[in-house]
Structure formats: C-alpha cells, structure tokens
C-alpha cells in the first residue's frame, strides 16, 4: 500500500547514572544507542495494526520506546496502557520525521504490558503495538575469568561462565606501570577467546555483560625486573586454575627456565615454555607453570630459576574460602575547611572485591588500586568538605566487609535562632562543639554584656544528621526576661557568632545577626 | 556467528501433535531470544511463537496461543516447539530464528539475526 508511511520503531536503554557525583539531577541518564524493534505490519488484522518486537526490561532500568514516522504532514497522536490514555506529544527531527516517544522510568512490574500508539497523519490511520515485559535478571552471573591452555597449541583461551554469555577480550600492554591504565594509548584490546601472542608485558583478560566487567591479571614473575621488597603472592581457591608465568630476555638462547615448587621440579604437564626472538634479536622466553585445579597441596613457594638471571619467587596461597582482611574499626576525622584530605581503606582480598562509598544515602564509585605489597588500597576523596558519617563497604563472593569513618570540619559555630511563648532556643554545627552563653540587654547593659545563667539548658549533639552533630541551648522564659532582647552565643576555638532574639510575645521573631569573631 | 537447524517435521493427522526441535552452534546459546516462525505456500512469513533468552517469558501469535508451547533447554543449545490440536491451516514451513540483543524479543521478523533453514509441517487426513 502506497499510502502507508514508512516508520521505524526503536528501543533506547538508558543507564541510570545514580552514582554521578555533582551532575545535574534535571539528567541523570546516559542513553545506549537505539536498538531496531523492526516494526511490521501484523497480518490478518483489521485497520492497519503494525507490531514491534517485544522489549524485555531490567526491574529498575529507564527505556524510551520511539517511533520515528517518514510522513508528509502534521501528526497527531495518542498513547493507550491499560486501557488509560497517555498524553502524547510528536515533535519533528532534523530529517524532517515525525518522532513519538515512551519514557518509562525506574521499570516495575505495573509498567510491564502492552502500549498502543494510535496515530492519525493527513494520509492515513494507524497503530503502533508494543509489547514490554520484566526480564529475569536473577538469572544473570559475571564471574572471573579463568584461563585454560588450549589443546594442542601454545595459546591461552579465556572463559567466563556467564549469564548472559559476556563479550571476552584480551587487554595487552607491553608498557611498565602507570602507561598500562585501561584508556593508555600503550593498551591493546582484542575481543576474542583465544590469545597466541603470550610474551606481552602486562597481560589481562576481561568479560563483560549487563552485570558490568570483570577480569583477570595473568600472574607474572619478570626475571629481568628488579624483584619487588615484597614477595609476590598469590591467592586462588580450591578447584581454581592457577597460572603463572615466568618471563626472562637475553641476548642470545643460550639459556632456560626451571620452575620448581618449594624446590621440588614440577611435573611434566604442569608447564609449558614458548620463545620468540624480540625486534632487537634478544631472546624471550616464557614458561607458564600451571595447575588446572588446584588443592591445598599446591600451596608454597613457586620459583622460577633461569642459567643467566636470578631466580625469583612467588607465594602462592590456596584458600578454602574467599576472604577480605582488613581493620574494620571506624576512624573519625578533623580536618580543616580547605585542606585536602582523602579517606582510605588498606585491605587484602580474594576474590576481589566489589566496593561502594556511601554518605548521606548517596553512593559514590569506589576504585581500588594494588601496592606492591599485596595490599589494595581505595580511596575517597570527594567529600566536598562535608561533616558527617562515611561508610566502605566491600564484598566478593565469600566475604563482607563495612567500615565506618566520621568527617569532622573545623569550623567557627554558625548559629540560629527560634523562640516559643516560653523559650527559646540557639543552634549550631560549628565544630569543635561549642560552648554556649545567654546575656540579657537592657538599660543597665545596652552592650548585652549581663550575663543570664538561670533557666539555661544545653545539649551537645542532639540531632544527627548523618553524623553530623549539632548543639543546642535552650533558655526557659522568666518574667525576668520577657520583653527584654537576649543574645545566645556559641564559641569555640575557631571564633564565636551570636544571635538576638526579642522576647514579647509568641510567633516567630526576628533575629538580628550580629557575628563577633 | 550462530548456525540453526531445525529437526522434527513431517506428515500429521488434524488434531495430532509434534515437536520441533532447533538446535544452535556457535557462539552460546544462552546469550539469544530465540523465535519460531512459519511460512505457508503463498503467504508472508509469520511468527508463531519467542522465548525471551532465559526462558523466563514466552509469546505466542493469537492463531497458535493455547496449543503450542515453546520451551528451550541451554544446556542442550536446542529450542523447542510443542504442537497440539494441529490442524490444516498450521501447514507450513516452520524456521527457527535468533536475534542478535538480549533486550529484544523475536518476535517479527526484521529482528532476526539468525535464520534456520526451516522444517516442513504436513497437517492432512
């Protein structure tokens, strides 16, 4: 039929991006690139009815449903759910197409269904069906990847059983330390199972699905490196695959590598050497030892010996059960309003963990690095200077682990004021917690200088507001006083401010600021 | 890349049953929404019946919903179509087909990335 427009039905998925530190809020979502919800034409029905693929979303997840309509003409339109119309405003892109859009935000099963789009061009009647479903997401796995030797050649394939089956890749560098960050000009990505070239510097493999990424370090000992002050040490679980791999260059192959377990040669099988001559004309070799399911036997002292460099070792460690070491004592903190300082957390785990920093039920990305001594580290220092409570929590899959810290700002005392019929009250965050003073100003003390001391009641830190303390005074109301201007004034180390409450009558009432430093 | 073949068509008597099997290889299984669809002499291709990729949600055409049931088992890579009360007009060429998102549904076919080769289905006294 001539007369039918030509539209386009597509799914945009958006990540929410909760976590976003100091972006707007009016915008919270990075969107993915649309994916083709191939609408067609449903036979047999009556009208023209076109149908789009069914859409299945993540409890939680943020999806736009979009039909973009090649007609001559205005459009107008109607969205139907559940037998409720939904308002619907068409708006034109750059191609000059019609484009109709479904936010769903934050999916829940209520939002699940079917979604009618009636439309109504110059030409032509039509309806748009969409179906969108909940997906099972408590099927879904990202575990680590392991490495397995493929038979019957020198090459590594790396698995991840995952579900659903993650994207692997290999990430290469052949740099030292800090040039091999992920986004390095001097890292290489190859998104396949199998890897032949295994003489690299730093060599990873990854796995990514909708659960995010996760990878694994292939073990290495650099018999031309100066041995770290630490011995190297490695942890694996029983039933874990374990693979190191011993690398050393001369300038000729007039040498070779031995690895030896607690100086015991391992057996044949459990290691295989490759060489290859670099661009210089030196001579690589590796030697992979490995063990294709570890038990506790296999723990001990793993060391590589070459004829023409020192040998160097590595501790290997088998577990029964993952584990996360760590002082989980809670840490408080003073510091002052512009100094830079971060919190940090100094842990060993295995398997690695997954980390969160949390303050004010907000959850900020956490990010782990390793020291040369085995320990991780992860720090937070986006606390834009705001007192209160902080909380690391970490997990792998065994273990868990929360610490506590407290952020203190020193700070002069800021104070507000309120009063009732019969008292009133002073506030303040300053910190330290200050100490309080009420002085009464009248004919005799046009300077507020006379002090009350009757009828005072202090109370240090009664409302946390996630962890931050705030003091307060209150003054109870005497015939004494009423109708007289009182000042309340907080100090502490830092300075003092102060606030002038009138006392007549009830209701609110003016404050005068008047801050003395 | 995903190779699908379809098995376990035939000759049926009205109001018998069969089961078509799909089985995939190549990249896992696991990772696709799979879908049945169906071709009669003359006619456009239809879809008769999808199985989102973890077999958590099924969708069915209104002609066939009640009668057949698809199911998939990942540990075999196979896709399975139960047909009951068959009748004539379920006569066709019956193909396995594979989309290439975990978020999309089989269930037209511009969406299909993967096509089996298909099975005949014979509904005749």
């Known amino acids: 039929n001539q007369d039918l427009p030509v539209i386009k039905c597509v799914l945009i998925n958006h990540k929410n991006n909760d976590s976003s530190v100091g972006k707007s809020s009016s915008y919270p979502m990075v969107s993915e690139s649309p994916e083709d919800l191939g609408c067609a034409l449903r036979p047999q029905s009556s009208g023209t009815v076109y149908e789009a693929a069914a859409v299945e979303v993540d409890v939680s997840a943020s999806i736009t449903l979009q039909v973009l309509v090649d007609a001559p003409g205005n459009i107008s339109c109607l969205w139907v759910f559940k037998h409720s119309s939904l308002n619907c405003q068409p708006h034109f892109d750059l191609q000059n197409r019609g484009v109709v859009s479904m936010v769903i935000l934050k999916m829940t099963e209520t939002q699940a269904g079917e979604y009618l789009l009636f439309i109504q061009s110059e030409a032509t009647n039509y309806t748009i069906l969409f179906t969108v479903s909940i997906r099972n997401t408590l099927l879904y796995t990202l575990r680590r990847p392991y490495f397995r030797k493929m038979e019957n050649q020198d090459a590594l394939v790396c698995i991840s059983e995952s579900v659903p089956e993650p994207i692997v890749e290999w990430v290469l560098c052949d740099s030292q330390g800090e040039s091999c960050k992920e986004e390095s000009p001097a890292v290489v990505k190859k998104e396949e199972k199998v890897l032949h070239e295994l003489f690299g510097t730093d060599i990873r493999c990854c796995a990514r699905n909708e659960l995010g990424r996760e990878c694994t370090r292939l073990f290495t000992i650099d018999l031309n490196q100066t041995p770290q002050t630490t011995l190297p040490q490695l942890f694996l679980k029983v039933g874990e695959p374990l693979w190191i791999r011993c690398k050393a260059v001369h300038v000729n192959h007039g040498f070779g590598l031995t690895w030896e377990l607690e100086n015991k040669a391992l057996e044949e099988g459990n290691y295989f050497e490759m060489s290859t001559y670099s661009t210089n004309r030196t001579m690589i070799r590796i030697l992979f030892a490995f063990v294709s399911s570890v038990a506790r036997n296999d723990t001990g002292y793993y060391t590589c010996s070459s004829s023409k460099h020192p040998s160097q070792s590595a501790l290997v460690t088998i577990v029964e059960k993952g584990f996360i070491n760590a002082t989980n004592s809670s840490e408080d903190y003073e510091i002052d309003q512009y100094e830079e300082f971060c919190f940090s957390v100094r842990f060993k785990a295995y398997p690695q963990i997954r980390c969160t920093w949390t303050f004010s039920r907000k959850s900020f990305p956490c990010e782990q690095k390793g020291l040369d001594n085995g320990y991780s580290i992860s720090k937070f220092c986006n606390h834009k200077h705001q007192p209160g409570e902080y909380i690391f929590h970490a997990e792998n899959d065994d273990a868990q682990f929360t610490k506590m810290f407290t952020l203190n700002i020193r700070r002069k005392p800021q104070v507000l004021a309120e009063a009732s019929a019969s008292q009133a009250s002073c506030f303040s965050d300053g910190y330290p917690l200050p100490s309080w003073t009420w002085k009464k100003c009248s004919d005799k003390s046009p300077n507020c200088t006379e002090e009350i001391t009757e009828g005072v009641w202090n109370r240090k830190a009664n409302r946390k507001v996630f962890g931050q303390w705030v003091s307060s005074s209150t003054l109870n109301m005497s015939e004494a006083i009423k109708g007289f201007l009182v000042k309340c004034c907080a100090y502490n180390s830092l300075g003092t401010s102060c606030e002038t409450i009138l006392l007549n009558s009830p209701g609110p009432f003016p404050f005068i600021q008047d801050n003395i430093s | 890349e995903v190779q699908l073949l379809e098995s376990g068509g035939g000759l049926v008597q009205p109001g018998g049953s069969l089961t078509l099997s799909c089985a995939a290889s190549?990249?896992?299984?696991?990772?696709?929404?799979l879908g049945w669809f169906r071709q009669a002499p003359g006619k456009e291709r239809e879809f008769v019946a999808a199985?989102?990729?973890?077999?958590?949600?099924?969708y069915y055409a209104d002609s066939v919903k009640g009668r057949f049931t698809i199911s998939r088992d990942n540990s075999k890579n196979t896709l399975y179509l139960q047909m009951n009360s068959l009748r004539a007009e379920d006569t066709a060429v019956y193909y396995c087909?594979?989309?290439?998102?975990?978020?999309?549904?089989?269930?037209?076919?511009?969406?299909?990335?993967?096509w089996g080769q298909g099975t005949l289905v014979t509904v005749s006294s």
């Open positions: 199985i989102s990729w973890s077999g958590g949600n099924t």
């Open positions: 087909a594979a989309g290439g998102s975990t978020r999309v549904v089989v269930t037209t076919t511009p969406v299909v990335k993967y």
């Open positions: 190549g990249r896992t299984f696991s990772s696709y929404a």
